[in-house]
């Protein structure tokens, strides 16, 4: 019996009967057998075929198998209904061999010319199987030249059979505190050879519960406990199961905060498999009351481990844990049951006793010594002397625990002095000047340090001077001796003040004119108004309207008198203001320079002479009565002017306050 | 965590103010609780000065409430000791600590001041 | 102002002894809200006080459990049962109850 080829060599060729393409013999038996490497499979046709038509081919034909499998038993020339010629069909192997058998028998009523068939291997596709089969793969089949290989989706890895797809189904850890979990896939079918472990792992003082759910699927056995497919439950205390079968299993309470569910699947079978619902449970905490006038956030049936709840005081309370503050407040719940923070009170907001105004006093107006939430108190600042600034006064106890005005402002309203109260009325012009009576001028300053000088009140901590009278100690401010609150200069009972810092004009220069000699002096503290210490206003913007030729400004100081002598008491004059031209041109014939009067400055006397301001009046104010706001406010300051005091044809010269008002305020603002 | 430093001048002369400073680090000082100033005296003895609120909110020791004073800077997250008019019996190691529940659970490690012409 | 008592100023131990020191306040320290503010702080040389026990009874956390505090109204115990080297120094009861909050003069535990 012939061979046909082998693998390796190549596969493929041609078979016909013997004699062919004449007639074949009578007796004739033939066999080939072929063989295509692994993974391959022969193809066969006919391109010829005439033998012996007989029932059910029992005389003359040709026979295909593979294996044991017989594929066709072939004769006559066309297909009957018993009976099969190939005609343009083709054949194939069902694996890598192919045999081919012909045969005749001992007679042929006419001749037949027999067969020619071609054959080839060619690749199997592994990947395509008939209906009804069982997949070649689990997932995904790949075909290729001589076999294939199976790969898995995401989640599986390939069984070492290399066409199971088993599940990556371990190394999940639930840590919350309820979930669900369920077999691979579920509720579609399990995958096969897979080995799954879960585990639940809670807090200590946790204890999971296990609910099966919706279905349960697990193959089984009538005889043996689950043989096939299982899944078990363990803690730390006990094992479940196995179980498998069609029931849902009861309700577990492990009464441990760590459980291990293993499921384990064979090769077999097609069951939808398990879901689990778990819940966890701990011993509970004391519920929560809420302090009076506050409420507890979340509110719940009960509080276990890791619950927690905030205390959330109304409008007005705020917490307080005993003494002390809090801005906030959480507990949690403890796995021993008790919660890890005592609970606060909800206590109402007390602002605490007013702060002291200084120059003022305070009232409670909601009841005596009353400070909490909504309690009204009415600062106020003592009459006559003190007004209160920007402000009514009236603060309320807010929720923030901060006594807070009408405007929203925390901080204590300002009793700021009132400045331009004097006891004098405008009297008659007396020559030479006259005695100061007691709060005639309160804001007059007497400076001592060096030289005798003098200098007026701006609110309660300032001093408005000129700069050639403190030039000298601008470096050395604690050196001046300040003195108010008296009219006699050698007097024992005065108000004494100390200088904390002293300004001078960055425009002034000494010894050189006296354009913009002007200065201020911070003192170290506050001073007390009263009567005899007042001080003077800074001149309004239409403080102008007031200052005109001729307006009467009054000057005071201790400042040489005509009999040449320091004043022993207070002295003052009434002089008009002298056009500033005419100043201007008495100043500049010799000895005086020219353009010793500056537009900083202004001039007031009399033509006459005989009323002035003299050596030691410097610094001193000259003020005038504004007659709308019926104060007194300083126009000018005391420069300089003739050698001789009271000249006629010279005037007094003085510093134009009102050219510096921005310089005052910002050294004040800043300072 | 929360952790607080006192600084300050290690020498101070009588009739002077004293102003200390503690710096605060890991925990805003306006977030909550009370920011304490507390004083250890050469003896041992402990002494609570007063505290300043989340809020700004302050509570004195009423023996020291005239010359004491607490204040803050949220920006720096830092609060202050001002203690006027100092005698020699002010000298003291002073500590700053932050309250929770309970009073002192945080406490700087200190700083020593001396009073002495 | 309350005043914090304690006794004994000195307390002389071997390692291993149980210790107790004495708290007694001049007036209730019941706080209007039920909570007793009692507190323990340790300071050892060269350190700043630590917290040990916080309303009467409960650690602070990391302070090990050889600490117990006990008491009510005026009367308050802390106890060490067995002393190890760690816990010498100086031991201060404090009052949080009332404003001004205040410290007792301290007890010394100390090696025989």
């Known amino acids: 019996t012939p061979l046909g080829p082998k693998w390796p060599e190549p596969v493929f060729g041609r078979l016909a009967s013997p004699g062919f393409p004449g007639e074949y013999a009578n007796d004739q038996e033939r066999r080939w057998t072929l063989t295509a490497p692994p993974g391959y499979r022969l193809r066969l046709y006919f391109t010829h075929f005439d033998l012996e038509l007989s029932h059910l081919c029992e005389y003359d034909f040709v026979k295909l198998s593979s294996g044991a499998k017989v594929l066709a038993t072939l004769c006559g020339q066309e297909s009957t209904d018993t009976e099969r010629a190939p005609g343009k069909d083709t054949f194939y192997s069902l694996g890598s061999s192919l045999d081919i058998t012909f045969r005749s028998d001992y007679s042929n009523e006419k001749p037949f010319t027999g067969f020619e068939a071609f054959y080839a291997a060619e690749d199997i596709d592994e990947c395509q199987v008939a209906p009804g089969e069982a997949p070649t793969c689990d997932h995904h089949c790949h075909n290729h030249l001589g076999g294939f290989y199976c790969s898995c989706r995401a989640g599986y890895v390939l069984h070492r059979n290399k066409r199971t797809c088993s599940a990556l189904c371990s190394g999940q850890v639930f840590t919350q505190r309820s979930g669900e979990l369920s077999s691979p896939e579920y509720p579609r079918p399990y995958p096969k050879l897979s080995s799954c472990t879960y585990s639940i792992s809670l807090e200590e003082g946790f204890s999971v519960i296990l609910d099966f759910v919706e279905s349960f699927d697990v193959e089984t056995h009538p005889e043996t406990l689950c043989p096939y497919d299982f899944l078990k439950i363990q803690t730390d205390r006990e094992e479940h199961g196995p179980f498998c079968g069609k029931t849902l299993p009861h309700r577990i309470e492990t009464k441990s905060n760590t459980v291990t569910i293993t499921f384990v699947t064979d090769e077999s079978g097609d069951h939808t498999g398990w879901k689990i619902h778990y819940t966890s449970t701990a011993q509970p905490c004391p519920y929560p009351m809420a302090p009076p006038n506050g409420h507890v956030s979340p509110v719940q049936a009960k509080y276990i481990l890791k619950d927690s709840f905030s205390i959330f005081c109304e409008t007005g309370y705020e917490l307080l844990q005993g003494h002390l503050p809090l801005k906030s407040f959480t507990a949690v719940c403890q796995k021993d049951g008790s919660w890890d923070r005592p609970m606060p009170a909800c206590s109402i907001v007390d602002c605490g006793p007013p702060d002291d105004l200084p120059s003022g006093r305070v009232e409670y107006i909601t009841g005596p010594g009353v400070t909490t939430y909504k309690a009204v108190i009415q600062y106020s600042c003592e009459e006559t002397f003190y007004t209160m600034k920007v402000n009514d006064g009236k603060y309320v106890c807010e929720a923030d625990g901060f006594w807070t005005s009408s405007k929203g402002e925390k901080s204590l309203p300002v009793c700021e002095p009132v400045c331009g109260l004097s006891a004098r009325t405008t009297g008659g012009r007396i020559y030479g000047g006259q005695k100061a009576k007691p709060g005639d001028f309160p804001w007059q300053v007497l400076i001592l340090g060096g030289t005798t000088a003098a200098g007026a009140l701006l609110y309660d901590n300032w001093v408005l001077t000129a700069a050639h009278a403190v030039y000298e100690q601008k470096h050395d401010a604690s050196a001046l001796d300040i003195r108010m609150g008296t009219l006699k200069r050698l007097s024992p009972h005065y108000t004494q003040a100390w200088s904390e810092a002293v300004f001078i004009h960055e425009g002034y220069t000494h010894d050189a004119g006296f354009d913009n000699d002007i200065a201020l002096i911070k003192l170290n503290n506050k001073v007390v108004i009263n009567s005899n210490i007042t001080p003077i206003c800074l001149p309004r913007k239409e403080a102008e309207s007031f200052m005109r030729t001729d307006d009467i400004g009054t000057a005071s100081g201790w400042g040489l008198t005509q009999r040449g002598f320091l004043a022993r008491n207070l002295m003052y004059v009434d002089i008009p203001i002298v056009d500033h031209q005419k100043c201007t041109a008495a100043y500049e014939k010799p000895p005086y320079p020219r353009g010793s009067v500056t537009a900083n400055m202004l001039c007031a006397g009399l033509e006459s002479g005989g009323k002035d301001s003299c050596r030691g009046d410097s610094g001193g104010a000259l003020v005038f009565l504004d007659s709308e706001t019926e104060r007194w406010f300083v126009g000018g300051i005391v420069s300089w002017g003739s050698m001789n005091c009271g000249e006629a044809g010279q005037y007094g010269v003085y510093t134009k306050v009102i050219n510096y008002i921005p310089w005052i305020e910002n050294i004040i603002s800043d300072f | 965590d929360v952790q607080l430093q006192e600084s300050g001048p290690g020498l101070v002369k009588p009739s002077q103010s004293l102003s200390l400073t503690c710096t605060v680090t890991?925990?805003?000082?306006?977030?909550?609780?009370?920011w304490n100033w507390i004083r250890q005296f050469p003896g041992n003895k402990l002494e609570w000065m007063g505290y300043i609120s989340y809020s700004g909110r302050t509570n004195y020791n009423p023996s020291l409430k005239s010359r004491f004073s607490i204040t803050r800077d949220t920006s720096k997250n830092q609060f202050f000791l001002q203690l006027n008019s100092v005698t020699t019996e002010d000298t003291a190691t002073y500590y700053c600590?932050?309250?929770?529940?309970?009073?002192?659970?945080?406490w700087g490690q200190g700083t020593l001041v001396t009073v002495s012409a | 102002d309350v005043l914090m008592t304690q006794t004994p100023l000195s307390l002389p131990v071997s390692l291993g002894d149980q210790a107790s020191i004495s708290c007694r306040s001049s007036?209730?320290?019941?706080?209007?809200?039920?909570?007793?503010?009692l507190e323990w702080y340790l300071q050892k040389p060269g350190q700043s006080p630590k917290l040990l026990i916080y309303?009467?009874?409960n650690r602070f956390s990391g302070v090990p459990d050889r600490f117990s505090g006990s008491g009510s109204g005026t009367d308050f115990t802390l106890k060490i049962s067995r002393v190890e080297a760690e816990d010498l120094g100086v031991y201060y009861c404090f009052q949080g109850s009332h404003i001004p909050v205040t410290f007792g003069a301290g007890t010394k535990l100390e090696l025989k």
């Open positions: 890991g925990f805003s000082i306006t977030s909550d609780y009370a």
């Open positions: 309303k009467v009874s």
């Open positions: 600590a932050r309250s929770y529940d309970y009073w002192f659970p945080y």
């Open positions: 007036q209730s320290i019941v706080h209007s809200n039920g909570n007793t503010f």
